[in-house]
């Protein structure tokens, strides 16, 4: 695999299930993997009568999903879990459900947060 | 409905090359929304994932056979095999093939039935 | 690699029971986990993914929870048909890995 032009080594972090799992809630994701291994951001949502509930967000290892991404787009039609990867630093700050079938194009801006560095 | 269907030798001889395919029928294997995998089980053992492939022919192994293992996928026959090199008895096993989601974490949702292969002189 | 650990490695319980399945990861996965069945001499069944999804077609009486390292697959009024192995598995390291299973037998 290799790593991607756009390398990646830092993604927006951010996990609803943060006191469970006893991490930070958001934050700053430094990437690791192995030197041949591509590395992506990605984010997870649900869709709850159009309500948008940010489940994940965080670093996500050599998938060839995420190749060559630079923007964050789920496409699957209506999943019970979404999700988009991409590549580049804090490329899943903001992400987007454009879905194969067609249909409209939804675009998620963050609130503003004050950044904690996570390693 | 989809169907996988593993096909090849029941029986290797060490030192030789294990080569297994897997006829999707049912669906379309250069369907970008899937990917397509290898997983093994010893006898009376769990399972080991092999590998995978996506229509694109992008491949990720086990690192544990990745310096014998491959795979590889013919779209114009709705196929995609494995071959695995130099076996020894440790490499006998029940070979499943399995349609995996998109991402890794769609979990592996068709298998094949299995295929028993046996590594003896 | 991650190592993905079950308990009990066999359970027995009667028809009707509740039977709780534990897996544990040797670090943090979020909650990319997969649970699948194994009959004797049939291919595995994917049940759950990402930790808590029901796949299609699976009865509800199976449910799954979890995230970090610690997960759970639990089958609320064990039928007979549900007398099998329970594999877990982790999917955002690579390898992925499954866990060494759980024997689910009649008592």
């Known amino acids: 695999s290799g790593r991607g032009e756009a390398e990646t080594r830092e993604c927006i972090y951010y996990n609803a299930n943060w006191e469970l799992e006893r991490t930070n809630q958001s934050g700053l994701e430094r990437c690791e993997g192995e030197q041949d291994k591509r590395l992506h951001c990605y984010a997870s949502w649900r869709n709850s009568s159009g309500t948008i509930e940010l489940v994940k967000k965080g670093c996500w290892l050599d998938d060839f999903n995420c190749y060559d991404r630079q923007e964050c787009v789920a496409t699957e039609e209506n999943p019970q879990v979404y999700f988009c990867c991409c590549e580049g630093n804090f490329c899943n700050e903001r992400f987007t459900h454009l879905p194969e079938a067609g249909g409209p194009e939804v675009t998620y801006e963050p609130p503003p947060t004050a950044p904690t560095l996570l390693t | 409905q989809l169907q996988l269907q593993e096909s090849g030798p029941g029986l290797v001889k060490p030192s030789e090359t294990l080569s297994l395919t897997c006829t999707v029928s049912?669906?379309?294997?250069?369907?970008?929304?899937?990917?397509w995998g290898w997983i093994r089980q010893p006898p009376g053992k769990g399972l080991e994932w092999i590998g995978s492939?996506?229509?694109?022919?992008?491949?990720y192994y086990n690192p544990s056979l990745k310096s014998r293992v491959t795979i590889s996928v013919d779209t114009s026959k709705n196929q995609f095999s494995l071959k695995l090199s130099s076996v020894t008895a440790a490499d006998t096993a029940v070979y499943y093939c399995?349609?995996?989601?998109?991402?890794?974490?769609?979990?592996?949702?068709?298998w094949g039935q299995g295929t028993t292969v046996t590594v003896s002189s | 690699d991650i190592q993905m650990t079950q308990s009990p490695s066999s359970v027995s319980a009667s028809v009707g029971d509740r039977v709780t399945i534990t897996c544990r990861a040797s670090?943090?996965?979020?909650?990319?986990l997969a649970w699948y069945q194994q009959k004797p001499g049939k291919a595995p069944k994917l049940l759950i993914y990402?930790?808590?999804n029901l796949q299609s077609g699976v009865p509800s009486r199976f449910s799954g929870s979890g995230s970090g390292t610690d997960f759970t697959l639990t089958i609320s009024s064990l039928q007979p048909e549900d007398f099998a192995t329970y594999y877990c598995?982790?999917?955002?390291?690579?390898?992925?890995?499954f866990g060494g299973g759980t024997k689910v037998e009649i008592k």
């Open positions: 399995a349609r995996a989601g998109k991402y890794r974490w769609h979990g592996m949702d068709v």
């Open positions: 049912g669906g379309s294997i250069s369907s970008s929304s899937y990917a």
């Open positions: 492939i996506y229509y694109s022919g992008s491949t």
């Open positions: 598995q982790q999917a955002p390291d690579l390898p992925i890995t």
């Open positions: 670090q943090g996965i979020s909650s990319w």
């Open positions: 990402a930790a808590s």
